[in-house]
Amino acid sequence: MAVTACQGLGFVVSLIGIAGIIAATCMDQWSTQDLYNNPVTAVFNYQGLWRSCVRESSGFTECRGYFTLLGLPAMLQAVRALMIVGIVLGAIGLLVSIFALKCIRIGSMEDSAKANMTLTSGIMFIVSGLCAIAGVSVFANMLVTNFWMSTANMYTGMGGMVQTVQTRYTFGAALFVGWVAGGLTLIGGVMMCIACRGLAPEETNYKAVSYHASGHSVAYKPGGFKASTGFGSNTKNKKIYDGGARTEDEVQSYPSKHDYV
């Protein structure tokens, strides 16, 4: 029950996170005009990853796309790439995790397969979240650098009475959406990975006695197969080295591949 809840919650949190990453990537307000030096401007500028916009006080908003690839700063291209990779990985992760959900039965899919898929989607969510956080952080760093550079050059060329105030940009709403969304996707991924441990088929303890067969040093289990799966370490024939009879409890259990996340 706890596993199902953890997995379900991880899926929902990741879903919200990825929706947020998509929203942040599409938003125009990655950077907004800093109004500290000119709070009475009648024109407000803001920029996104794909276009820049100008909102006039009169209510008119004009947006222009960046219709060039080569002319854009490498950092902006990098941020775009990180966000897109984050979205793609997240989308694939969501698709995989839908099939991995314990509450959804698809054919005769075994728990080990669901565990694998849960782990895979969890890792994808973690990487997706990290991509979004990295992308937003790179953009934020770029803004901070440019902000202080433009502050230093703010009144350059003030030969006479005329002032030319450079437009400075500060953090836009999309950055905060991106950070939160990336964090949620990351948390969702971690939850999926935790849920994966609980989904992994565990050793079932059978109190059946293993008998040493003459001529073979192999222990046979009577009816020792799991009802629903053909996998798991219990189905393996285990070698008994001392030739004596012992209960299955005493036989060393080999670690499952899902025991370590």
Epitope: T41, N45, Y46, S58, F60
Partner: antibody, heavy 117, light 113 residues
């Protein structure tokens, strides 16, 4: 078509409050801003203030303590209130709609307000 | 506040001749976001309200004859009437539409020589 019409008392006593109304038609009050501009007799234009579509206002720095601009969307009206008037406030008062580039693209005919005792 | 200075105060030009009015702002009116200058030109005839001629320094308002043109960037702007007509006699004002208060220039009175 867009129309603006100013109305109000033509004569106001010094130290009283000047109240004007601008009745508009042909555009949405929630989408566009309206500015108030005055012109003293024989002089140039002076921008007083503006109320935007979202209800926010901006006033001329010299009049900020005396000027209030508001709107009544249900009546399609904008109003200007200028307190503690003096003879220097005698002018033709215009209301005008803000358009592209924040430019004033439609103007009312104006109303002359004289401040005198 | 941005101070708008117009020159000359008055101008007399012969019919059919070119008329040029200048406007200078104390701060740049160029918006870096869209590379547009937030300067507007108005025409006011006696007894009438002002009429919008040009916004964004060079964009003609619809219905305005093409003999009117605006130019300039940053702090220096010009309104040009390529061939003066009798109906162009008026006072012309420039306005800062970039920063509040949206100040007007002092006006230039255009007459026929």
């Amino acid at each position: 078509q867009v129309q603006l019409q100013e109305s109000g008392p033509g004569l106001v006593k010094p130290s009283e409050t000047l109240s004007l109304t601008c009745t508009v038609s042909g555009f949405s009050l929630t989408s566009y801003g309206v500015s108030w501009v005055r012109q003293p007799p024989g002089k140039g234009l002076e921008w007083l203030g503006v109320i935007w579509g979202d209800g926010s206002t901006n006033y001329h720095s010299t009049l900020i303590s005396r000027l209030t601009i508001s709107k009544d969307t249900s009546k399609s009206q904008f109003s200007l209130k200028l307190s503690s008037v003096t003879a220097a406030d005698t002018a033709v008062y215009y209301c005008a709609k803000a358009g592209r580039g924040n430019a004033l693209d439609y103007w009312g005919q104006g109303t002359l307000v004289t401040v005198s005792s | 506040d941005i101070v708008m200075t117009q020159s000359p105060d008055s101008l007399a030009v012969s019919l059919g001749e070119r008329a040029t009015i200048n406007c200078k702002s104390s701060q740049s009116l160029l918006n870096s976001g869209n590379q547009k200058n937030y300067l507007t030109w108005y025409q006011q005839k006696p007894g009438q309200p002002p009429k919008l001629l040009i916004y964004w320094a060079s964009t003609r308002e619809s219905g305005v004859p093409d003999r009117f043109s605006g130019s300039g960037s940053g702090t220096d702007f010009t309104l040009t009437i390529s061939s003066l007509q009798a109906e162009d006699v008026a006072v012309y004002y420039c306005q800062n539409d970039y920063s509040f208060p949206l100040t007007f220039g002092g006006g230039t009175k255009l007459e026929i020589k």
